[in-house]
C-alpha cells in the first residue's frame, strides 16, 4: 500500500480468482483513543472499533472511503483505491490502446518544434468518475524539470456503438535549448483513477522523435505565362523553430485529382517554392518535415488548382 | 560561442555537400544495423545514449546560431579551445568563434573515425561475419575531415589484446551509430546555417 495523495491510498493486488488479497491496517488520524468506530462509504454499518482497523482487501467491494467517527463526529477519512496486477502485468483497463506506432501505445505525444513544449493525448470510453494527473521529467535517475498543465477533455467521437473521449495535456521543459542533442529521454507519467480503480501509464521519448511541424503557411499559386504550369509557393509555419537556416524543413508537393484513384504527382524540395502542372479540378498540397531528422510529416496544406 | 551572421557567400561553402553525404551515410548504416541486429537491443528505446565526445568537444555550444545565444539554456556549458585554421573558412571575415565551431566538428569526426575503425577491426574477426561498417560511411567521414582541413595530432587506432566480445561490440556499434547520427544532424544544421549566412 502506498499514498497517492493526502488520505488517498493505493492497494496493489495480485488479481486472480480466489486470491488472498492484501491485509491493510488503517489508522484514525486523531489524538482520541476510545469510542472510535469505522464505516465504509455511505453505509452506516460499523466495520470495527478502535483507533486502527485491519481489513483484508480482495476486491473492489473492499475499496472505497473508510471513515472513523466518534459520537457522530467524523474524525478522518482514508480512500482506498485498487491497482490490479494481472499475471505480472499491471492492468490497463481505463485507457484505450491506440496501437500506433505499436501495440500497447496508450499515450501519444507530439511537438511542433524544438522548444521543449509538447502535447500528449490519450483515449478512453469512460465518461464519468474519471480523473487524471500528469507528471513529467527529463530522465528518471536524476530528473530535470518539465512542467505539465492539467489534463483536459479535448475531443469526443462516436466509434460504432461507443463514444470515445480524448484527453490531452501540454507540457514544457523548464530549461530547453532547441539546438541541444538529447541524451536523456522525456518521461511522461499519467495517473488515472476511475471510481476505485487506479492505473498508471508511462511514455518515454526524445523530443526529436515526436516532432511534427505545423503545415506550411501562405500556400499560393502563380500561373506561369503560356503554360499549364504554376509556381507554388509557401512559407515555414510560424510555430517552427528559428533560425530556419539551422532548423531547416524539407517539403513534399502533391498534385491530386478530384478522384482518389487518380495518380498523384509528388515533388520533394528543400525550397519554399516549386513548379508543377496544375490539372483541372485538381488540388495542390504541401507538407513539411524536418530536413535532417526524419520524424513525422506535417498535415497537408492545400489549395485548389482553379 | 556562437556563429556570426556575416560568413561566406552562398555556394562558397564546400562542407555543406559533404555534411549532407555524411548524414545520408550514417542514417543508412544505422538502418542496416537495426535490420541486421534485430535480435540485439539496437533501437533508440533500447540503447544507452552515450556521447563519446562529451567533455572533449563542445560542438553544440561552439556552433550555436547567433539567434539562440539569447537563450540561457543554450549557454550553460563548458568552454573548450581548439586549433583554428581550416579550409572551409572560405572567407577572411570568418570569426574566431566559427573557427572554433568547425574545429570542434573536425575533432568529433576524428574521434568517431578512430572508434569506427577499431570496431570494424573487431567485427572482421567475428566468425558469424554478421555486420561490418559501410566503407562509404568511413570514406565520407574522411572527405569531410579533409574539407575541414584542420591540423591536428593523429589519434592512434586503439588496439586490444583481449579476445573481443562480439555481442558487446555489436551493442557498442548501435550506441555509436545512434550518437553519430545525432551529431551528423547537428553538423548538417550548422553547415546549412553557415551556407545561408
Amino acid at each position: 500500500i502506498w499514498e497517492l495523495k493526502k488520505d488517498v491510498y493505493v492497494v496493489e493486488l495480485d488479481w486472480y480468482p480466489d486470491a488472498p488479497g492484501e491485509m491493510v491496517v488503517l489508522t484514525c488520524d486523531t489524538p482520541e483513543e476510545d469510542g472510535i468506530t469505522w464505516t465504509l462509504d455511505q453505509s452506516s454499518e460499523v466495520l470495527g472499533s478502535g483507533k486502527t482497523l485491519t481489513i483484508q482487501v480482495k476486491e473492489f467491494g473492499d475499496a472505497g472511503q473508510y471513515t472513523c467517527h466518534k459520537g457522530g463526529e467524523v474524525l478522518s477519512h482514508s480512500l482506498l483505491l485498487l491497482h490490479k496486477k494481472e499475471d505480472g502485468i499491471w492492468s490497463t483497463d481505463i485507457l484505450k490502446d491506440q496501437k500506433e506506432p505499436k501495440n500497447k501505445t496508450f499515450l501519444r505525444c507530439e511537438a511542433k518544434n524544438y522548444s521543449g513544449r509538447f502535447t500528449c493525448w490519450w483515449l478512453t470510453t469512460i465518461s464519468t468518475d474519471l480523473t487524471f494527473s500528469v507528471k513529467s521529467s527529463r530522465g528518471s535517475s536524476d530528473p530535470q524539470g518539465v512542467t505539465c498543465g492539467a489534463a483536459t477533455l479535448s475531443a469526443e467521437r462516436v466509434r460504432g456503438d461507443n463514444k470515445e473521449y480524448e484527453y490531452s495535456v501540454e507540457c514544457q521543459e523548464d530549461s530547453a535549448c532547441p539546438a541541444a542533442e538529447e541524451s536523456l529521454p522525456i518521461e511522461v507519467m499519467v495517473d488515472a483513477v476511475h471510481k476505485l480503480k487506479y492505473e498508471n501509464y508511462t511514455s518515454s521519448f526524445f523530443i526529436r522523435d515526436i516532432i511534427k511541424p505545423d503545415p506550411p503557411k501562405n500556400l499560393q499559386l502563380k500561373p506561369l505565362k503560356n503554360s499549364r504550369q504554376v509556381e507554388v509557393s509557401w512559407e515555414y509555419p510560424d510555430t517552427w523553430s528559428t533560425p530556419h537556416s539551422y532548423f531547416s524543413l524539407t517539403f513534399c508537393v502533391q498534385v491530386q485529382g478530384k478522384s482518389k484513384r487518380e495518380k498523384k504527382d509528388r515533388v520533394f524540395t528543400d525550397k519554399t517554392s516549386a513548379t508543377v502542372i496544375c490539372r483541372k479540378n485538381a488540388s495542390i498540397s504541401v507538407r513539411a518535415q524536418d530536413r535532417y531528422y526524419s520524424s513525422s510529416w506535417s498535415e497537408w496544406a492545400s489549395v485548389p488548382c482553379s | 560561442r556562437n556563429l556570426p551572421v556575416a560568413t561566406p557567400d552562398p555556394g562558397m561553402f564546400p562542407c555543406l555537400h559533404h555534411s549532407q553525404n555524411l548524414l545520408r551515410a550514417v542514417s543508412n548504416m544505422l538502418q542496416k544495423a537495426r535490420q541486421t541486429l534485430e535480435f540485439y537491443p539496437c533501437t533508440s528505446e533500447e540503447i544507452d545514449h552515450e556521447d563519446i565526445t562529451k567533455d572533449k568537444t563542445s560542438t553544440v555550444e561552439a556552433c550555436l546560431p547567433l539567434e539562440l545565444t539569447k537563450n540561457e539554456s543554450c549557454l550553460n556549458s563548458r568552454e573548450t579551445s581548439f586549433i583554428t585554421n581550416g579550409s572551409c573558412l572560405a572567407s577572411r571575415k570568418t570569426s574566431f568563434m566559427m573557427a572554433l565551431c568547425l574545429s570542434s566538428i573536425y575533432e568529433d569526426l576524428k574521434m568517431y573515425q578512430v572508434e569506427f575503425k577499431t570496431m570494424n577491426a573487431k567485427l572482421l574477426m567475428d566468425p558469424k561475419r554478421q555486420i561490418f561498417l559501410d566503407q562509404n560511411m568511413l570514406a565520407v567521414i574522411d572527405e569531410l575531415m579533409q574539407a575541414l582541413n584542420f591540423n591536428s595530432e593523429t589519434v592512434p587506432q586503439k588496439s586490444s589484446l583481449e579476445e573481443p566480445d562480439f555481442y558487446k561490440t555489436k551493442i557498442k556499434l548501435c550506441i555509436l551509430l545512434h550518437a553519430f547520427r545525432i551529431r551528423a544532424v547537428t553538423i548538417d544544421r550548422v553547415m546549412s546555417y553557415l551556407n545561408a549566412s
Partner: antibody, heavy 115, light 111 residues
Framework: QVQLVQSGGGVVQPGRSLRLSCAAS????????MHWVRQAPGKGLEWVAF????????YYADSVKGRFTISRDNSKNTLYLQMKSLRAEDTAVYYC????????WGQGTMVTVSS | SYVLTQPPSVSGTPGQRVTISCSGG????????VKWYQQLPGTAPKLLIY???QRPSGVPDRFSGSKSGTSASLAITGVQAEDEADYYC????????????FGTGTKVTVL
C-alpha cells in the same frame, strides 16, 4: 471454490461451426479476464483467444483470427468460443482458463473436425 | 504463433535433480514473467510455478523456477515417479495479456 465446467465439444465436418461454453462458479466472474487454450492430440499447448473482464477487448492467435469469436455473458457467468469454418487442424482438446498469476483451468472439451 | 523452446525430453532416476530449460526472446521472457505447468496424461495442465519462481500452495517444494535474461528453467530436486509428466513454460509477448505464449513442452521420464 473456483470451478470451470466446459461443454459443447463434439465431432464436426470441415467448414462447419461449433460453439463451446465454459460455466464459471465460485468467484466473481465479471471481474476477471478469460482465455481459451487448445491442445491437438499428441501436441503442445496453444493459446487461442483472450477476453477482458468486461468484454471490451478481445485478442486472437493468428491461426484462428477471423474464424473464431470469444465472448462472455457476465450475467450468466459463462464464457463462449464460437468456431466457424472449422478445419482438420482445429482438432484439439479446448480448455478455458482464468487470467491471472494463479490461474484455474476447465476440464477440457474435445473438438474433432473430420469428414 | 510465438514459441518458447524446450528440450523434447529429459530423464532422471528417483532422487536425482532434473532441470528443464525454456528459451525465448527479448519480447517474451525477456520482458515478462514465466509460468510452468505440469500435465499428466488425459488431464488439464496444473500450475507449478508463477511469477518466475513463486510456488502456489500445495505444490511440493522440490519444484523451483528461475529466470535469467531471455531464458527460464524449472528444476525438480529429488525427482519422484509421480513427477513423470509433460511440462510447459508460458509467458506473454510484449507485455500483452492478449498474447500468451507456450513452450514446446518437455516429457520428463523417471527411470
Amino acid at each position: 471454490q473456483v470451478q470451470l465446467v466446459q461443454s459443447g465439444g463434439g465431432v464436426v465436418q470441415p467448414g462447419r461451426s461449433l460453439r463451446l461454453s465454459c460455466a464459471a462458479s465460485g468467484f466473481t466472474f465479471s471481474s476477471y479476464g478469460m482465455h481459451w487454450v487448445r491442445q491437438a492430440p499428441g501436441k503442445g499447448l496453444e493459446w487461442v483467444a483472450f477476453i477482458r473482464y468486461d468484454g471490451s477487448n478481445k485478442y486472437y492467435a493468428d491461426s484462428v483470427k477471423g474464424r473464431f469469436t470469444i465472448s462472455r455473458d457476465n450475467s450468466k457467468n459463462t464464457l463462449y468460443l464460437q468456431m466457424k469454418s472449422l478445419r482438420a487442424e482445429d482438432t484439439a482438446v479446448y480448455y478455458c482458463a482464468t487470467h491471472g498469476s494463479q490461474d484455474n483451468w476447465g476440464q477440457g472439451t474435445m473438438v474433432t473436425v473430420s469428414s | 504463433s510465438y514459441v518458447l523452446t524446450q528440450p523434447p525430453s529429459v530423464s532422471g532416476t528417483p532422487g536425482q535433480r532434473v532441470t528443464i530449460s525454456c528459451s525465448g526472446g527479448r519480447s517474451n521472457i525477456g520482458s515478462n514473467t514465466v509460468k510452468w505447468y505440469q500435465q499428466l496424461p488425459g488431464t488439464a495442465p496444473k500450475l507449478l510455478i508463477y511469477g518466475n519462481d513463486q510456488r502456489p500452495s500445495g505444490v511440493p517444494d522440490r519444484f523451483s523456477g528461475s529466470k535469467s535474461g531471455t531464458s527460464a528453467s524449472l528444476a525438480i530436486t529429488g525427482v519422484q515417479a509421480e513427477d513423470e509428466a509433460d511440462y510447459y513454460c508460458q509467458s506473454y509477448d510484449r507485455g500483452f495479456t492478449g498474447s500468451r505464449v507456450f513452450g514446446t513442452g518437455t516429457k520428463v521420464t523417471v527411470l
